[in-house]
């Protein structure tokens, strides 16, 4: 069987939701010593980067200028060390936003509720779309989808203090082309007095996966790490095939 290197990690720098006409940046984190990285879009070669010097950096950035609906979709990347190619990365969905119109987001029964109450968000957009998306700030990968002609419902069920936070919605013209974001709606959830200190909370840290973690290294340590990584991979493939 053909030997391959471990798959790289593909990430969007800052966010995978890119306003139209702005620049998107995708990072492909592979291995020290990789001489070539390829970015694939919808299964076809999209761009090539060759790091310099290859042994001192573990990945590359691909800049995609002037974002539009034709560049929105599924991206993946691969890399090469010598003549050996890696497996393909997982797929990354790159979305273009700020298309057409702005929806309105509202919450029922209201923006401040007691823990245990049932809450429903409503996203409304009068232009032609049937798919709506709800995102919580700091949790942009946890996209909820709902469908409706003009207005979609997002039932949250009985809420806890973990639901506290700021929410926005989008109308979606297809999976990768979204409207402008709604104005945010902040949901406050009050717990019972004795429960409040024990209630789970959901800190809205920035999306850690939307950070490029490329490192530039010097010295023998990384050369040894590369040798060890390659040796382990070599052993792994021979051991299992």
């Amino acid at each position: 069987p053909k030997q391959t290197l471990p798959k790289p990690i593909i990430r969007a720098e800052s966010t995978y939701m890119v306003p139209k006409e702005k620049q998107a940046t995708l990072c492909c984190q592979g291995s020290y010593g990789a001489v070539e990285y390829q970015l694939h879009f919808e299964g076809s070669l999209f761009a090539v980067e060759r790091p310099k010097p290859p042994e001192r950096i573990n990945g590359v950035k691909f800049h995609i200028p002037d974002m539009n609906s034709r560049k929105a979709g599924r991206y993946s990347c691969i890399y090469r060390v010598g003549e050996l190619w890696s497996e393909r990365s997982d797929l990354l969905d790159l979305v273009v936003t700020e298309m057409y119109d702005t929806p309105t987001l509202s919450v029922h029964p209201g923006p401040e509720v007691t823990s245990g109450e049932k809450v429903t968000f409503y996203c409304r957009l009068d232009t032609a779309t049937s798919m709506f998306l709800l995102l919580k700030e700091g949790r942009s990968r946890d996209v909820q989808r709902s469908y409706g002609k003009v207005q979609a419902e997002f039932p949250m069920g009985p809420v806890t203090t973990a639901h506290r936070g700021s929410y926005r919605c989008f109308g979606s013209y297809n999976n990768y082309a979204w409207s402008f974001p709604s104005e945010p709606v902040k949901l406050l959830v009050t717990g019972d007095i004795e429960n409040t200190s024990l209630a789970p909370t959901d800190p809205t840290f920035p999306d850690s996966w939307d950070t490029c973690l490329l490192t530039r290294e010097t010295g023998l340590q990384k050369d040894l790490a590369l040798w060890d990584h390659t040796a382990q991979n070599h052993h792994h493939h021979h051991h299992h095939h």
Partner: nanobody, 122 residues
Framework: DVQLVESGGGSVEAGGSLRLSCAAS??????MGWFRQAPGKAREGVAC??????????DYADSVKGRFTITQDNAKNTVYLQMNSLKPEDTAMYYC???????????????WGQGTQVTVSS
Amino acid sequence: DVQLVESGGGSVEAGGSLRLSCAASGYRQRTMGWFRQAPGKAREGVACIYTGPTTTFTDYADSVKGRFTITQDNAKNTVYLQMNSLKPEDTAMYYCAANLAYPLTIIPDTRWGQGTQVTVSS
């Protein structure tokens, strides 16, 4: 079921004031508001009020901000719309609504009153 009864409409000259009332019978309504519809125009939101566990929230259409004030008397289950500095373009049928989403959004379970006419002459 919820019954909504509006009152307080009438005719007034531009710059004048009116106070609309909406009494809700049945269970307590936490989000109530006012919508209006002028002849030949679409119904539009005017103002709404939501009473949360610790805080009361209000929302207004841009066209009435600074002129209209919405308040709620929870004991009477009644919502009021104080309308000052009225303009001819405020002329419309005003409808009370209960069980809205906040801010100022009609949902499938929203309940409506019969309406009260407001006429502002120049």
